[in-house]
């Protein structure tokens, strides 16, 4: 660093800024000598409002440094980002956002739960709010699924009127025909492929309503579709295998007691969907009187042995192999309780007695021409077979 030149003025001795130090330290600094400033951990080099990664000044022949001394300013992570459906609390002190400050994110109680981490973030030396796991991204407030006002457990035929909060995942799909769906998370709707097939290239034509019991009520939460994803194995007009679709909403819906997503089945869910276990279907489809229901209806129906169901649909007019391993059947042998036209796409739900949450086991798909017919059953898409498909689409889009 020493370059000896005659007749050049030494530069003023560099006084390190607070929370910084000069390197190298010399007795004097003459032409072309230089020094750098290094800040303590948690402090950053700033020249005015502009940040610097490094700072080196060089002594000029007029005896001045070529740059003014920077400041070592305490790192300020700035106000933390707002957490959708959550809030943030300053732990260190009101509005304190500097190095080592702590904040705590939390989600709105009852309807949301925190994913990713515990919500505690610290302002680190790099200037980013960082979780104990090292994440710099926000935690996620995920809607709590499967909450219902019903504590026990459509094609709704022979059903009862639903009460507020009974089926908060119920979605009414208009645009072509009347169909149904079930809310997943806060921006997806699970439905039957055949119910939305005609709109697959015109997603915006789907009029999606939720948070209401009355089919014709003007009081509902409106949602619009951004995209429709139909299972690639579904072939329209060639049976109902893979009769499943997802609708991505263009905005997240606000979760409350009347709008809550249904849970997807856990791996262990099959134990709650054995033959004779009771599922509940809900919808605004045809009732025993032959008209679309005005009020949301529901029916509790038992799962039917798969072989028995397969046999029921082996005889004409049904083609052989109508009932596949991707379907489950539910209904009474004596008839009278069933889902019906207009219920398509709705969820057949079951109570997981371990988590005390409702999950979707089936999607209303097809059945006999005469709903509720004795010896015939409602056929539902078996959702558990499609968990990877659902998860892939939701994570990719």
């Amino acid at each position: 660093h020493h370059h000896h030149h005659h007749a050049s003025q030494p530069c003023p001795y560099p006084m390190a800024p607070p929370n910084g130090h000069v390197s190298p330290v010399q007795a004097k600094y003459i032409l072309k000598d230089s020094f750098s400033i290094f800040c303590e951990t948690g402090y950053e080099l700033l020249q005015g409002h502009l940040p610097l990664k490094s700072f080196t000044a060089v002594c000029q022949k007029d005896g001045s440094w070529d740059r003014p001394m920077p400041a070592c300013s305490i790192v300020d992570c700035g106000p933390p980002d707002d957490l959708p459906s959550g809030r943030v609390e300053y732990i260190t002190g009101p509005g304190v956002t500097t190095y080592k400050a702590v904040i705590q994110y939390s989600c709105e109680e009852t309807f949301y739960t925190m994913k990713v981490n515990d919500g505690k973030y610290v302002c680190e030396a790099d200037g980013f709010w960082t979780s104990s796991k090292g994440e710099k991204s926000l935690p996620v407030c995920e809607p709590v699924c499967g909450l219902s006002a019903r504590t026990t457990g459509g094609r709704i035929y022979g059903g009862q009127k639903a009460k507020p909060g009974d089926f908060p995942w119920q979605v009414l799909i208009l645009g072509g025909t009347t169909a149904a769906g079930a809310l997943l998370y806060d921006n997806w709707v699970l439905t039957a492929a055949h119910a939305v097939y005609e709109q697959k290239h015109d997603a915006s034509a789907l009029d999606i309503r939720m948070g209401t019991l009355k089919r014709l009520s003007p009081h509902y939460t409106q949602a619009w579709s951004e995209a429709v994803f139909i299972h690639e194995g579904y072939t329209h007009d060639a049976g109902f295998d893979n009769d499943i679709a997802l609708i991505k909403l263009n905005n997240k819906v606000v979760i409350n007691s009347n709008i809550t997503p249904i849970c997807l089945p856990r791996k262990e869910a099959e134990s709650f969907m054995r033959t004779d276990d009771i599922g509940t279907a809900s919808g605004w489809g045809l009732t025993q009187r032959g008209f679309l229901a005005r009020n949301l209806m529901y029916v509790d129906i038992p799962i039917v042995d798969h072989q028995k169901c397969t046999a029921a649909y082996e005889k004409p007019p049904y083609p052989r192999g109508s009932v596949t391993a991707n379907m489950l059947c539910a209904g009474l042998e004596s008839g009278g309780k069933d889902s019906c036209r207009g219920d398509a796409g709705g969820a057949l739900v079951f109570l997981d007695s371990e988590t005390e949450r409702w999950f979707v086991g089936g999607i209303v798909s097809w059945g006999s021409m005469n709903c509720g017919e004795a010896g015939q059953y409602g056929v539902y898409t078996k959702v558990i077979n499609y968990i990877p498909w659902i998860e892939n689409i939701i994570s990719d889009f």
């Epitope: 409002h49 740059r67 980013f128």
Partner: antibody, heavy 118, light 108 residues
Framework: DVQLQESGPGLVRPSQSLSLTCTVT?????????WNWIRQFPGNKLEWMGY???????SYNPSLKSRLSITRDTSKNQFFLQLNSVSSADTATYYC???????????WGQGTTLTVSS | QTVLTQSPAIMSASLGERVTMTCTAS???????LLWYQQKPGSSPKLWIY???KLASGVPVRFSGSGSGTSYSLTISSMEADDAATYYC?????????FGAGTKLELK
């Protein structure tokens, strides 16, 4: 030689979002400095919008903070501006720039003209 | 925010004339963090003076800058035709960074 080059759509409809890209050559955006977006209105008034620093931290003009996001792609040595809910008042020439930090190191792009109109 | 007021807004000078324009800050600015830019029509602004008084590379020595606190100025000792342009001051002492509205210098 350090060069900055803005690219963008030229025309945006009111209420839509504006996205601009600044491609930097001759210097890595992670090496040092703050990488700024500045705009110049038709009457020639200049407004600093915000920056993203070498470390990825951002600082925004409070007048734009609710609508503005500056991000980067270090693998492509690019940084980006996104301005939401644009109106005719956002019609301007948009520049990306490194502003001198008390040294003779100051570079601006050529600017990209944006018109907001239906 | 720190408002920078430039005056005059427009001025004209003859060849060889001494020219001074000012930049007044609404609150004190460190002289280290005040810049001047020159801009000609159709071009982006060019750094002209940094740290109040240091000339950017390629800037003729007839230009000078001075000032402290809230009062800054740019002076041309002898106007030349190529100096006709708009000059802007900029402070980056604190956020947000702010520019003056500019002084348009025309050749008389």
């Amino acid at each position: 030689d350090v060069q900055l080059q803005e690219s963008g759509p030229g025309l945006v409809r009111p209420s839509q979002s504006l996205s601009l890209t600044c491609t930097v050559t001759g210097y890595s955006i992670t090496s040092d400095y703050a990488w700024n977006w500045i705009r110049q209105f038709p009457g020639n008034k200049l407004e600093w919008m915000g920056y993203i620093s070498y470390s990825g931290r951002t600082s925004y003009n409070p007048s734009l903070k609710s609508r503005l996001s500056i991000t980067r792609d270090t693998s492509k040595n690019q940084f980006f501006l996104q301005l939401n809910s644009v109106s005719s008042a956002d019609t301007a020439t948009y520049y990306c720039a490194i502003i001198s930090t008390a040294v003779d190191f100051d570079y601006w792009g050529q600017g990209t003209t944006l018109t907001v109109s239906s | 925010q720190t408002v920078l007021t430039q005056s005059p807004a427009i001025m004209s000078a003859s060849l060889g004339e001494r020219v001074t324009m000012t930049c007044t800050a609404s609150s004190s600015v460190s002289s280290s963090y005040l810049l001047w830019y020159q801009q000609k029509p159709g071009s982006s602004p060019k750094l002209w003076i940094y740290s109040t008084s240091k000339l950017a590379s390629g800037v003729p020595v007839r230009f000078s800058g001075s000032g402290s606190g809230t009062s800054y100025s740019l002076t041309i000792s002898s106007m030349e035709a190529d100096d006709a342009a708009t000059y802007y001051c900029l402070q980056y002492n604190r956020s947000p960074l702010t520019f003056g509205a500019g002084t348009k210098l025309e050749l008389k």
